[in-house]
Interface confidence: low
C-alpha cells in the first residue's frame, strides 16, 4: 500500500478560499499534503 503514518485530517484555509493563483503558485503546505494522504490512505 501507500505506507506512511496516519495523520489527523487537517483543515487548510487555502482549501476554502482558493484563487487561480493560490493553488498553482503557492507552495503546497506540509499540512495540505498530510491531509490528502490521510484521506487517500483512510479511504481504502
Amino acid at each position: 500500500g501507500g505506507g506512511g503514518s496516519k495523520h489527523k485530517c487537517f483543515r487548510n484555509s487555502l482549501e476554502n478560499n482558493e484563487t487561480l493563483e493560490s493553488i498553482m503558485n503557492t507552495l503546497e503546505s506540509e499540512e495540505d499534503f498530510r491531509k490528502y494522504f490521510y484521506y487517500l490512505e483512510g479511504s481504502k
Epitope: 501507500g2 482549501e15 493553488i23 498553482m24 503546497e28 495540505d32 499534503f33 494522504f37
Partner: antibody
C-alpha cells in the same frame, strides 16, 4: 525557470535493474510532492508513483509495486526511481512531474527512455 | 481503480473551428473536501505532456483562454473555442482524486 530533467534511461535486460533520476531547479523542491509517469511507445500515460514533499509518504501503481521504489534527496533537489526485476512491459518513456496541491501534475520533465530487451 | 474513458478518440478539426472532447469516469471524482480533481493535459507530437486545466475548469498559467473545461461528478468536457495549428496533439484527462491516479486513453486532435 522551473525545470525538471530526467536521466538514467537506457537499454537493460529483463530481470535487471535501472535507476532513474530527476534533477529539479527553479522552485523549492522540498515543498512539493513528486511523481513518476510513464508512456509506452505509441501508447497512453500511466501513473507510476508519488512521493510526498518530505519523503515519508509513497504510493505506487499495482503494476510496479514491490519492484520499483521512489526516493528523493531534498538537499540535492533530486528525485529517484529504482526499478528492479524489469520486464518487457516496463519499456516506456519515464517522466517526472511536480505535484501541486491536490496532486495536480503541473510541471513535467522531457522524459527518459527505458528499453527492456534481451 | 477509477477507469477514465474519452470520446472521441480522434477528432479531425478545421482551423478556426471549435472542438470538444468528453471524459467520463467510472465513479464520482468528488473528494470529501468538496473538490473534484480532474485535469486536462495536452501532448504535442514529440513533446512531454503539459497541464492545461486543473480541478475541472481552472486554466493553468500561460494556457490560452480558447481552452475551457466544464463538468461535474463523472462527466467532463474540454472545449477549444477556435482550433489553431499549435493545438494539434493528444489530449488526456486525468483524475487525482483516488489512488491509483488514472488517465483517459487520449484524444488525438489534428487538422482536416
Amino acid at each position: 525557470q522551473v525545470q525538471l530533467v530526467e536521466s538514467g534511461g537506457g537499454v537493460v535486460q529483463p530481470g535487471r535493474s535501472l535507476r532513474l533520476s530527476c534533477a529539479a531547479s527553479g522552485f523549492t523542491f522540498s515543498s512539493y510532492g513528486m511523481h513518476w509517469v510513464r508512456q509506452a511507445p505509441g501508447k497512453g500515460l500511466e501513473w507510476v508513483a508519488v512521493i510526498s514533499y518530505d519523503g515519508n509518504n509513497k504510493h505506487f501503481a499495482d503494476s510496479v509495486k514491490g519492484r520499483f521504489t521512489i526516493s528523493r534527496d531534498n538537499s540535492k533537489n533530486t528525485l529517484n526511481l529504482q526499478m528492479n526485476s524489469l520486464r518487457a512491459e516496463d519499456r516506456a518513456v519515464y517522466y517526472c512531474a511536480r505535484g501541486a496541491s491536490g496532486f495536480v501534475l503541473d510541471i513535467w520533465g522531457q522524459g527518459t527512455m527505458v528499453t527492456v530487451s534481451s | 481503480d477509477i477507469v477514465m474513458t474519452q470520446t472521441p478518440l480522434s477528432s479531425p478539426v478545421t482551423l478556426g473551428q471549435p472542438a470538444s472532447i468528453s471524459c467520463r469516469s467510472s465513479q464520482s471524482l468528488v473528494r470529501s473536501d468538496g473538490n473534484t480533481y480532474l485535469s486536462w493535459l495536452q501532448q504535442r507530437p514529440g513533446q512531454p505532456p503539459r497541464l492545461l486545466i486543473y480541478k475541472i475548469s481552472n486554466r493553468f498559467s500561460g494556457v490560452p483562454d480558447r481552452f475551457s473545461g466544464s463538468g461535474a461528478g463523472t462527466d467532463f468536457t474540454l472545449k477549444i473555442s477556435r482550433v489553431e495549428a499549435e493545438d494539434v496533439g493528444i489530449y488526456f484527462c486525468m483524475q487525482t482524486t483516488q489512488f491509483p491516479f488514472t488517465f483517459g486513453p487520449g484524444t488525438k486532435v489534428d487538422i482536416k
